[in-house]
Interface confidence: medium
């Protein structure tokens, strides 16, 4: 029962992570530039995202513009876009794999096969979490680097946008949820670890470990 509870918790976390990731990727709030300081009356705020940028005037009016051409975009932005989409698709794939191996489904009958699928889905979710983390950390690094660059005009110094925080949250949830799924899978059936060793010798190293044998730092 504890195993089932952890599985459900893991999936709920990954689902929350996926939704956070989707919102993070979609929102144009990766970089925020507040045009204050050098012209105090012109309190314009620029939000930049992966797909569009928005200008919020001091009057409260907001204008958004979708980026024109894919090829004209900077390479780091193109890479961030690609990684974001791949991460979301990978997480969706992980969900499908989990559903196939979930205790409450009949897609797969054998308990040990179900356990393997749950483990696989956990690994896929962890990969998705890492893929989500890369563009978020890269963008944050660029913002911080520019912030401390004396040549960058003060008015153009950006701040970390809400999307980055959502991205970190998404990555954390995917890693945590995936980690929980990886931890629950060895107790997938009544058979002990030796049973797995006998029946699935080729994949034994991946699924014969008890939860205590996994280095916990991988799932933090």
């Amino acid at each position: 029962m504890a195993s089932a509870g952890m599985q459900i918790l893991g999936v709920v976390l990954t689902l929350l992570g996926w939704v956070n990731g989707l919102v993070s990727c979609a929102l144009p709030m990766w970089k925020v530039t507040a045009f204050i300081g050098n012209s105090i009356v012109v309190a314009q705020v620029v939000w930049e995202g992966l797909w569009m940028s928005c200008v919020v005037q001091s009057t409260g009016q907001m204008q958004c513009k979708v980026y024109d051409s894919l090829l004209a975009l900077p390479q780091d932005l193109q890479a961030a876009r690609a990684l974001c989409v791949i991460a979301l698709l990978v997480a969706l794939f992980g969900l499908l794999v989990y559903l196939a191996g979930a205790k409450c489904t009949t897609c797969v009958e054998e308990k040990d096969s179900k356990a393997r699928l749950v483990l696989t889905s956990g690994i896929v979710f962890v990969i998705s979490g890492v893929l989500t983390l890369i563009p978020v950390c890269w963008t944050a690094h660029a913002i911080i680097r520019d912030f401390y660059n004396p040549l960058v005009a003060e008015a153009q110094k950006r701040e970390l946008g809400a999307s980055l925080y959502l991205g970190w949250a998404a990555s954390g949830l995917l890693l945590l949820g995936g980690g929980l799924l990886c931890c629950t899978c060895p107790s997938g059936g009544s058979q002990g670890p030796s049973h797995y060793m006998a029946r699935y010798s080729t994949s034994a190293p991946a699924i014969s470990r008890g939860p205590s044998e996994y280095p916990t730092k991988n799932y933090v």
Epitope: N38, S39, I40, Q44, V55, P74, P150, A153, E154
Partner: antibody, heavy 118, light 107 residues
Framework: QVQLVESGGGVVQPGRSLRLSCTAS????????MHWVRQAPGKGLEWVSF????????NYADSVKGRFTISRDNSKNMLYLRMDSLRAEDTAVYYC???????????WGQGTLVTVSS | AIQLTQSPSSLSASVGDRVTITCRAS??????LAWYQQKPEKAPKSLIY???SLQSGVPSRFSGSGSGTDFTLTISSLQPEDFATYYC?????????FGQGTKLEII
């Protein structure tokens, strides 16, 4: 309406000094950063200097750093450019321009000609 | 300093033509690029800011695009009053820099 009027230009010998003024009207001068931009005869535009709305920060082009000083008097709606150790290559029309934040140089003056010649 | 290279440096066109001027930055300047129009013996006039936003009062036949290092100014249908010199300018890094200008002449 927004108006910027430069004055103080003229002919000056190399090594001497000159002070340009820019009178602003039609907007709350103390709320806006201000720039000086110059244009040598028959040449392109060159940004010279920028001063924040409250005079707390300034920036200069490398070609004038240490020789030119930008300042302002918000009570008089005036922007100044003090030019020392003038060189022949400083000969240009000098424009003052308002910093509109995101819109950068949104309003310009008509310019004042500075000729550095012996 | 960031170098801005405009091309072409001069351009001949007729009224009604569609014209495109490009501006390339020596390194990424995000979207912090403006375009100006200057007529002989006159002060420059702001056309486009933040790469693609039209300055208020500027006709909609003017448009800007680009991000990073490559930018374009497009005039969809040239009018007689559009014949002038056009400059791009970056305001991401100090010192702020201008392109060398593109002179648009009438055929």
């Amino acid at each position: 309406q927004v108006q910027l009027v430069e004055s103080g230009g003229g002919v000056v010998q190399p090594g001497r000094s000159l002070r340009l003024s820019c009178t602003a009207s039609g907007f709350t001068f103390s709320h806006y950063g201000m720039h000086w931009v110059r244009q040598a005869p028959g040449k392109g535009l060159e940004w010279v200097s920028f001063l924040w709305f409250d005079g707390s920060k300034d920036n200069y082009a490398d070609s004038v750093k240490g020789r030119f000083t930008i300042s302002r008097d918000n009570s008089k709606n005036m922007l100044y450019l003090r030019m020392d150790s003038l060189r022949a290559e400083d000969t240009a029309v000098y424009y003052c321009a308002r910093n509109g934040g995101l819109t950068i140089f949104d309003y310009w003056g008509q310019g004042t000609l500075v000729t550095v010649s012996s | 300093a960031i170098q801005l290279t405009q091309s072409p440096s001069s351009l001949s066109a007729s009224v009604g033509d569609r014209v495109t001027i490009t501006c390339r930055a020596s390194q990424g300047i995000n979207s912090w690029l403006a375009w100006y129009q200057q007529k002989p013996e006159k002060a420059p006039k702001s056309l486009i800011y933040a790469a693609s936003s039209l300055q208020s009062g500027v006709p909609s036949r003017f448009s800007g695009s680009g991000s990073g290092t490559d930018f374009t100014l497009t005039i969809s249908s040239l009018q007689p009053e559009d014949f002038a010199t056009y400059y791009c300018q970056q305001y991401n890094f100090y010192p702020y820099t201008f392109g060398q200008g593109t002179k648009l002449e009438i055929i």
